[in-house]
Interface confidence: low
């Protein structure tokens, strides 16, 4: 036997008390699928949250964060304070990255500089609080005849020997 409530579309609920009539969702509520016996309450974007998309009878409101904060979690379930590049957020607020670490974003944690020597490379550009080190070529790359970092030779015309 087909459930009569399955005929109730999104935006309505199936009211048991009214012989399973499909009634519209009350204000500030929604049902995104058919056959619901109750409507979900709309999410309210309050405080540090701001409304990115208003609630409708068939879809929930969507929130993002006010300037100076960024979203965390599925569906922006939390707003976390931004920090500057070169900082990370701790329980005591934004703190500069320790020496040897960097953060090139307004969120997240400070990460250690790349250890160039692990790849047998040298440090080409030193790291800062905001930027990772830039690793240069390995000593082997600098040996005569190595082509990996030397610029390509200009194309030669046929029949001409190199000068």
């Amino acid at each position: 036997l087909q459930d009569p409530c399955s005929n109730c579309p999104a935006g309505t609920f199936c009211d048991n008390n009214r012989n399973q009539i499909c009634s519209p969702c009350p204000p500030n509520s929604f049902s995104s699928a058919g056959g619901q016996r109750t409507c979900d309450i709309c999410r309210q974007c309050k405080g540090v949250f701001r409304t990115r998309k208003e609630c409708s009878s068939t879809s929930n409101a969507e929130c993002d964060c006010t300037p100076g904060f960024h979203c965390l979690g599925a569906g922006c379930s939390m707003c976390e304070q931004d920090c500057k590049q070169g900082q990370e957020l701790t329980k005591k607020g934004c703190k500069d990255c320790c020496f040897g670490t960097f953060n090139d974003q307004k969120r997240g944690i400070c990460r250690p500089w790349t250890n160039c020597s692990l790849d047998g490379k040298s440090v080409l550009v030193n790291g800062t609080k905001e930027r990772d080190v830039v690793c240069g070529p390995s000593p082997a790359d600098l040996s005569p005849g190595a082509s990996s970092v030397t610029p390509p030779a200009p194309a030669r015309e046929p029949g001409h020997s190199p000068q």
Epitope: C5, F13, D15, N16, N17, S23, P26, S32, G35, Q36, R37, T38, D40, I41, R43, N60
Partner: antibody, heavy 117, light 107 residues
């Protein structure tokens, strides 16, 4: 038959935590909301919070931070977790099905929680 | 929070009497009001939802009315099995709140 059965009540020390369950049958948690309501001995009903079909929750302001309502749709079970219990949390805890325009049309029999040292 | 105040807190009436219980909200609740019955030592039962809609299986002697901040539950002819405590509950705004209850006894 639609049924809600609470379990997990008992004697808890002040400062302790509570986790009670509401096992439902005869309907799906993906289409109905479930509320928790408590009743202190000889007192009236107090609404604690609700978990919606989509998993969202709303709580009584007085319990925010101490109360978490969650559910496992596959087990047809809703959970109430409360921390930092006080003697005034002693009550019968009911779960109730939220239907239609948010009336509680079916209630469990309740589980007694006693907070005492 | 919206405060719900029921009156009287208790009342005694005779079988066959017309009984009225009132519920007053601290602000307008747009008819978003339910009534529940709790018999001694028993669980809670829904009587009326959305101010005046009778829940299925509830005797027709129960009725509800009201608007704005003031709402009423009426039992047209009191029966012995109506001995219970009655609660109103608003769902206009979170947190949802109950009245303190009205205890009904038979004279």
């Amino acid at each position: 038959e639609v049924q809600l059965v609470e379990s997990g009540g008992g004697l808890i020390q002040p400062g302790g935590s509570l986790r009670i369950s509401c096992a439902v049958s005869g309907f799906s948690l993906t289409t109905y909301a479930i509320s928790w309501v408590r009743q202190a001995p000889g007192k009236g009903l107090e609404w604690l919070g609700i978990i919606w079909p989509g998993g969202g929750t709303n709580y009584a302001d007085s319990l925010k931070g101490r109360l978490t309502i969650s559910k496992d749709n596959s087990k047809n079970t809703v959970y109430l977790q409360m921390n930092s219990l006080r003697t005034e949390d002693t009550a019968v805890y009911y779960c109730a099905r939220g239907a239609g325009t948010w009336y509680f049309d079916v209630w469990g029999q309740g589980t007694l929680v006693t907070v005492s040292s | 929070d919206i405060q719900m105040t029921q009156s009287p807190s208790s009342l005694s009436a005779s079988v066959g009497d017309r009984v009225t219980i009132t519920c007053s909200a601290s602000q307008g609740i747009s008819n978003y009001l339910n009534w529940y019955q709790q018999k001694p030592g028993k669980t809670v039962k829904l009587l009326i939802y959305y101010t005046s809609s009778l829940h299925s299986g509830v005797p027709s002697r129960f009725s509800g009315s009201g608007s704005g901040t003031d709402y009423t539950l009426t039992i047209s002819s009191l029966q012995p099995e109506d001995i219970a405590t009655y609660y109103c509950q608003q769902y206009s705004k979170f947190p949802w709140t109950f009245g303190q209850g009205t205890k009904l006894e038979i004279k």
